[in-house]
């Protein structure tokens, strides 16, 4: 059974992930972002189901494309280089979902824009955090 300390650690990691995703979303939605139109043409794949930490596998598989989209944005929109930002997110996602569990992600039929994609995973983080508190 998860201990209170492991639950707290999970909560902190989710909060960190949530902040990173919100920061990316804010940077993309910046009214001075000249690449927004092109960024919105990138297709992102959404999970059919995202209710447990293991479902973060679906997020992990989209982090490569997410890095490429962030490479289009002006670096001043973000505190870190896209490579470093995604690297940080990968570490958090890996710790949350575990590296040993090989969960096969199932994707929804409809693709999403980067904004819809980020909002979906922000909602996921908020939902899991609320169950832990």
């Amino acid at each position: 059974a998860p201990t209170s300390s492991s639950t707290k650690k999970t909560q902190l990691q989710l909060e960190h992930l949530l902040l990173d995703l919100q920061m990316i979303l804010n940077g993309i939605n910046n009214y001075k972002n000249p690449k927004l139109t092109r960024m919105l043409t990138f297709k992102f794949y959404m999970p059919k189901k995202a209710t447990e930490l293991k479902h973060l596998q679906c997020l992990e598989e989209e982090l490569g494309p997410l890095e490429e989209v962030l490479n289009l944005a002006q670096s001043k929109n973000f505190h870190l280089r896209p490579r470093d930002l995604i690297s940080n997110i990968r570490v958090i996602v890996l710790e949350l979902k575990g590296s040993e569990t090989t969960f096969m992600c199932e994707y929804a039929d409809e693709t999403a824009t980067i904004v819809e994609f980020l909002n979906r995973w922000i909602t996921f983080c908020q939902s899991i955090i609320s169950t832990l508190t």
């Epitope: 990138f42 992990e60 490569g64 494309p65």
Partner: antibody, heavy 123, light 107 residues
Amino acid sequence: QVQLVQSGAEVKKPGATVKISCKVSGDTITAYYMHWVRQAPGQGLEWIGRIDPDDDSTKYAENFKGRVTITADTSTDTAYMELSSLRSEDTAVYYCTTITFYYSRELRWFAYWGQGTLVTVSS
Amino acid sequence: DIVLTQSPATLSLSPGERATLSCQASQYIGNYLSWYQQKPGQAPRLLIYSATSLASGIPARFSGSRSGTDFTLTISSLEPEDFAVYYCLQHYSTPYTFGQGTKLEIK
């Protein structure tokens, strides 16, 4: 169906420069990140680098930096790979290949390939 | 750089047999791995992407699996046209790297 057609074989002297082309047909080049991969005779595959033709941003493998230049001409839907200071170890078949984030998940991988261009470096 | 180690270097089997090719990553790469088939004088052809997904037009006898940093390409029943060289490739981070290849030859 997307097709990549590369320029013909080249024979170069050591120290020279070679420029290979890769023409995209069936779609616009700006929908793809154009990558270059090489294969020395009887050897494995080695990633050289890539260009985003939409904004000309490039990424190169460390061991090619300073010698390789990847460019793209969106008016002709053609990508180019230029390698300078050629040496005998650069003798290889050079391939262009694509990645895109605009279509299916499968096309995020090296799904389309050119036929290859043999570059021979010999004195 | 991420190193991919393929084994065996050469695999000698007969048509109808099952082939199991291995690719081990030097670090965690998630599912960012694909498999390619290459025949002499031809460009590589995408077989499997995202570790387990079958590329379009590829026969169902090809399949991919993953356990941690170990990846496997399985050909359930070899056809004569399957004898070729197979490469794995990681897309987790640049520089993208390939395994050194496994040559599948007729016994």
